[in-house]
Each structure stands twice: as C-alpha cells, then as structure tokens.
C-alpha cells in the first residue's frame, strides 16, 4: 500500500506564438481545480478499468480575475498535494490523466459552471519511494509543469511497496539475513515469504510462496525482461540463458505501445494498434468510460455505440460540450419577447414579462382596453402593452374620472390670469402681452409682433385658448 | 460492473432514528452525483435526497418532507454515501435505495433497504 | 412541486400487442422526462431519459414521445418480461418526481 502524489507547480502558456486567452474576466472571475487519473501501464485490465489505481480532485485555487489588456499569466492554482491512495503493491509503470478545469463563479443558480481547460496524458516507468520526478506536458497553447512521486505507507517498503518493515526485535540489529528497513533504520525487513529466488526489484507476492512479476518482467522468478518480439527473430545473437535469439535493435524492440497496444514494423518506423479504450502514437492516451465520471453538472452517461466513442454525455438543460462542462448562455438568444427579462435559473428558463404581455416568452399581447371604460367620453388606447385613455377635453387621470383643472399648471405667461373655461382655459393678460398664453409682447408704438388681432379682439383682451 | 448495496435498515420507533449505509463499487464515486429514492405502497416512489461533489463543497438537496430531519453525506475514501434519519414519523417507513445519481435519470440503484416507523 | 400523474394504474395486455402508458405533467417540463421499470422484487431500471432516449441495454421496442405536459411510453411487442411496474419522473425541477406508476398485466 502506498500514496501516489502530484505536485502542480504551473499552468499557464506555453512558449511560442498564439498565447491562449486568460480563462478568466472582469466579468467573469474562476479558479482552477485539478484531476488526475491513474491506471496500471500495461494491466490487461487497465483497458476496461476505470482509474483503476485511483483517482484524486483537488481542492479549488484562488479566485481570479483577468487584468484587462494583459497576457495570460500562470494561473493562480490551489494549494496542496493530489493523493492518490493505492492499495496493493506499486506496478512501476502507470498512464497518467491530469485534467485541468475551470469554475466559472458567476452568480449560478443551478451552481458554478465547469469546463475543461486542458487534458494531458501519459505513460511513465515509476519506482516506489524514489525522489519526485519532474515533467511537463503540453495541452494545445497551454502548459502544466508538475512533480510526482510514489510513496510507501508503513510498514509497506521498497520499490512496489511489497516489502514489508517491522519494529527491531532486538535493539542492536536486525535478526540473520535481514537488513535495517532504509529510511527507518530502527525497523527491520520482515521475514521474505515469497517463492525462494523471487527477484527482489522485479517480483513481489502477496502470499506466501508466490512469486508476483512487476510490469515488463516475466518468469517463475520475475528474472526475464518481458520482450514481445519473437524468439525466432533473425537478428541478434543466441543468448545461452534463454535459448532465444535476443533481437537486436529494431523499431518495435521493448514495444513502444503503452496499454495492451500491439507495435507492427513499418518501413521507417512502427505502427501501434491500440485496444479499445486507447489512442495516441503510442496508445498512451487512455479512453475515459463512464464508469469514470467524465459527466460534469449532473449529465448522464452512456456507453457509445460505436468502439471509437467510449461515452456519450446526455446534458441536463442549461448545459452543453461533450462533457456537460459548458453552461448554455440561453438567455443571450433573447428568448423573451416583447421586452421581457431573461432569468436563466440554470434548470429553467423563466421570463419576466412587462406590464400587458405574458406567456412562457412573453409572446401574448394582453388587450389591456378590454373591460376597461375610459370615463367622461374618453377613448381607450394600447400602447407599449400598458392600458392608456385619452381623455375628453376638462378630464384627466388614468381612467378620464378627475376633472382637470385646466389651471393647475400656471399656463399664463407674463403674470397672465388663467380662468377655467367649459372648454378649456382662457388666459387674461397683463398690459403690454397678447397671445393664447401671453407669451408674446405688444410693441410700445401699439403695433404688434404678430399680425393684427382678429377682430373682435384688443391687444390685453382675455384670449380663449383653444 | 456497478454494484451499490444498502444496509442500516431496520425497524425503529416513531421519534427514533437511524444510519443507512451504501458502499458503492465499479465505477468513479468521487465523481458522481449521489442519492437516495424511497419507495413506499401508499407513496410509491418518492426522490430523498441528492448529495453532489467536493468540487461543489458536497452540496445537497432534499424533499420538502425530511428537510431538517434527514441529512445525506458522502465518504469518497470509503466509496460510500449515507443517510442519517432522525425524528422518524410512521410515513417515513419504506424500501430506501441508494441511487447513482445525476440530473438525467437514475442510472444505477441498489437492492434496497428496508426502514419500518412503527410503535 | 410538479405533480407527475399516470392516470392508469393497471392495464391488460396481449404478448405481442403494442401498449401505450401515458404520464402527464402539472406543468410545462419540457422533455425534461425519464421512464423506470420495476419488475416483481427488484430495483427500478433507468429505460428512458430526456424523454425518448434509451438507456444502455435497453431493447428498440421501448420508445417515448411528447414534450411540455404529456408524454408516453410505447412498448412495440410486448414480451413476457416486460410485465412490470412502469415510473415516470421529471427532472426539470427540485423536488424530483416521480409518477404514481403504471402495472401491465396479462388480459
């Protein structure tokens, strides 16, 4: 048993031209959170198993938001270890996952919006309780720097976390034939059960008297490097331990094909043949099923119906790409008519419809005059789907029920007097102005600035304004 | 293959309270939705509670009738998620199944098990 | 809360005939649906989601139709095996839920 760790050390872009954008805005402010998946290199299972040595998310990193105008930064990336617990012994070579997500944290009903930034994979040969390994891999314009490591947990040591430690029975050293445990000097290996002759580097058993080989190893004593070409090979010389021809240096020697994947020569180079499940040059890239949980923000997993498509993810409403990771703007296509606001509540759609309109989008005009009487002679009116009437002359109000008090605006210019008049207001002047309103002066040689009054009236004679 | 068992069952007093257990095997479970389903002859079948995942802070939802009352948790070490039932009423007696859940359909349930409110 | 009503709770059958189970929603759900079949002392099985897809394994035979309030599950052929209780639920909203259930049963 042991703990296979993952240090994230950077995410961000990679060398060269055509940065990526900043995942992140003003607008919009995220954080980062990390997956990692892991399964045995070349386990006939690992083809079918989901992570089958586990898997790990994990925590979320600081909030961040873009700085308008400048480049995409190294992202700010949460704090801590990915651990991946695996109970049994370490197989030395392992396919890794690490996927890189992004939480939206805009204001979700329906709960943060996730979609998937970068996904890189690989194959690697790892020996337990070794030191971190370093690496980098590349995602399309972006790029993850990390360390890893495999670790034993007491009193599992060595390379598979096989062997096993126990607490010195005597203070001085260890019993006959067992070494101190490095690094716990005070403790001792425990008594080897296995087969007698299991090679200590490439074996190891889980009960007594077996002999267990370690990945790329084979034989009763996990003695004889795995080699998947031919013993009838031309090349190379007879080798006296085996019998065999060992080959000699060809494009397909030590099979370059990760996971089950069979090599085939090809003139200049070789050609990989990856079990279902798997892509990649070197059948390095491992095929997610659903068993794996590739269905974010409630999506529902079914197998594809074809050997190419492993999965297919069927999104709950609000939600789309091939992995539910993207949540749907619904309301950017203005599905609300008539000036209705857009409530995305990330299950549902809802409108908030104007006065006069209803409907799922608002799509249904009320007929706001309908039953409504407009008093005193005034006629109804629709508009803008708000019930209006036009009122008589001497009426006013909502409904043309108050009488209007012509007056009430001081309509008079000029210190004018207004009297309410049956049909409408009459403005009587002060000396020296003439006009419905008073608003024009009369000039002091008795000539006005208009033409002449109609007849019947005198400059400063009360004037019916009609 | 995915397989989910329940267990915790039992029959217990009105007032009372229990723990169900579902250890779920065969698939991811840190990275799934997780629920229980009850199902009862006069109610028939009734959704419980909903728990969702770490990177969602383990959010959960719950029926109207056992909020306050019932809370689903989850261990992903343990592959398991639970259901604490408390201030247990005589309706809240039924097969209690543990589901893989998800917004779009139940894919997976366990056997179930049986939880009997009676004095 | 959505209401799901299946207004039938038994209905009688032929081996071979072709069977309609009805589900109405109280209000608009979209194609928000799924369909369970509960065979005597089992678990219910996942047949249909999003209204007329089917799930993993699940035989040609059974298809679904509708959308907004009424929906349908038709199975073609009916088989001996098909004799269960049928559910349906919507997931458009919190609370889920479900119908009250659908028995076939041999005329």
């Known amino acids: 048993a042991g703990v296979f760790e993952l240090q994230i050390h950077s995410f961000g872009p990679g060398p060269g031209p055509g940065a990526p954008r900043s995942p992140c805005s003003a607008r919009l402010p995220c954080r980062l959170f990390f997956r990692v998946c892991l399964k045995p290199g070349l386990s006939e299972e690992a083809a079918e198993s989901p992570c089958a040595l586990g898997a790990a998310l994990s925590a979320r990193g600081p909030v961040y938001t873009e700085q308008p105008g400048a480049p995409a930064p190294d992202l700010p990336l949460p704090d801590g270890l990915l651990q991946v617990p695996f109970r049994d012994a370490w197989p030395g070579t392992f396919s890794f996952i690490i996927e890189t997500w992004r939480e939206e944290l805009g204001d979700q009903i329906g709960g943060p919006a996730w979609s998937l930034l970068a996904r890189v994979a690989g194959r690697r040969r790892l020996a337990a309780g070794g030191p971190w390994a370093r690496d980098i891999q590349r995602a399309g314009a972006w790029e993850l720097r990390f360390s890893y490591r495999a670790r034993c947990e007491p009193p599992a040591v060595g390379t598979a976390c096989t062997r096993l430690c126990r607490p010195r029975s005597a203070p001085s050293r260890c019993g006959p034939g067992l070494r101190p445990c490095a690094p716990l000097e005070d403790e001792c290996e425990a008594p080897l059960v296995c087969r007698a002759g299991c090679s200590p580097e490439h074996g190891f058993c889980e009960q007594p008297g077996e002999c267990r080989c370690l990945e790329g190893w084979t034989g009763p004593l996990c003695t004889v490097p795995v080699s998947t070409s031919s013993c009838l090979s031309p090349r190379g010389p007879s080798s006296a331990t085996t019998g065999c021809l060992v080959p000699g240096p060809g494009p397909c020697d030590g099979n370059p094909c990760a996971n089950g994947g069979s090599c085939s020569e090809t003139p200049r180079s070789f050609e990989c043949t990856c079990p279902r499940g798997f892509y990649g040059l070197r059948c390095e890239v491992s095929g997610v099923t659903c068993a794996d949980g590739p269905c974010f923000n409630g999506g529902l997993c079914v197998g594809g119906a074809d050997p190419d498509s492993a999965y297919i993810c069927h999104c709950p409403p609000g939600f789309q790409g091939s992995n539910c990771e993207k949540r749907v703007d619904r309301c950017s296509l203005q599905p609300c008519r008539n000036g209705g606001l857009c409530l995305d509540l990330g299950h549902a759609l809802r409108c908030r419809c104007r006065a006069g309109f209803a409907g799922p989008r608002c799509e249904h005009d009320l007929d706001d005059c309908a039953g409504r009487a407009c008093a005193n002679g005034g006629t109804c009116v629709e508009g803008g789907g708000a019930h209006r009437c036009s009122c008589a002359l001497g009426f006013g109000g909502r409904d043309c029920r108050e009488r209007a008090d012509p007056c009430a605006a001081r309509p008079c210019a000029h210190g004018g007097r207004c009297y309410a008049h049956f049909s409408g207001l009459v403005c009587a002047c002060a000396p020296g102005y003439m006009g419905a309103r008073c608003e024009f002066p009369v000039h002091p040689d008795g000539a006005s600035a208009l033409p002449a009054a109609p007849p019947g009236l005198r400059p400063g004679d009360p004037q019916r304004y009609l | 293959e995915v397989n989910l068992e329940e267990s915790g069952g039992g029959l217990v007093q009105p007032g009372g309270s229990m723990k169900l257990s579902c250890v779920a095997s065969g698939f991811a479970f840190s990275n799934f939705w997780m629920q229980w389903v009850r199902q009862s002859p006069e109610k028939g079948l009734e959704w419980v509670a909903q728990?969702?995942?770490?990177?969602?802070?383990?959010?959960?939802h719950y029926a109207e009738s056992v909020k306050g009352r019932f809370t689903i948790s989850r261990d992903d070490s343990k592959s398991s998620v639970y259901l604490q039932l408390n201030n247990l009423r005589a309706e809240d007696t039924g097969t209690y199944y543990c589901?893989?859940?998800?917004?779009?359909?139940?894919?997976?349930w366990g056997q179930g098990t049986l939880v009997t409110v009676s004095a | 809360d959505i209401v799901m009503t299946q207004s039938q709770k038994f209905m009688s059958t032929t081996i071979g005939d072709r069977v309609s189970i009805t589900c109405k929603a109280s209000q608009n759900v979209g194609t928000t649906v799924a369909w369970y079949q509960q065979k005597p002392g089992q678990s219910p099985n996942l047949l249909l989601y999003s209204t007329s897809n089917r799930f993993t394994g699940v035989p040609d035979r059974f298809t679904g139709s509708g959308s907004g309030t009424d929906f349908t599950l038709t199975i073609t052929n009916m088989q001996s095996e098909d004799l269960a209780d049928y559910f349906c639920?919507?997931?458009?909203?919190?609370?889920?839920?479900f119908g009250g259930g659908t028995k076939l049963e041999i005329k």
């Open positions: 728990i969702r995942l770490k990177s969602d802070n383990y959010a959960a």
């Open positions: 589901t893989q859940g998800n917004w779009v359909g139940f894919a997976y």
């Open positions: 639920q919507q997931y458009n909203n919190y609370p889920l839920t």
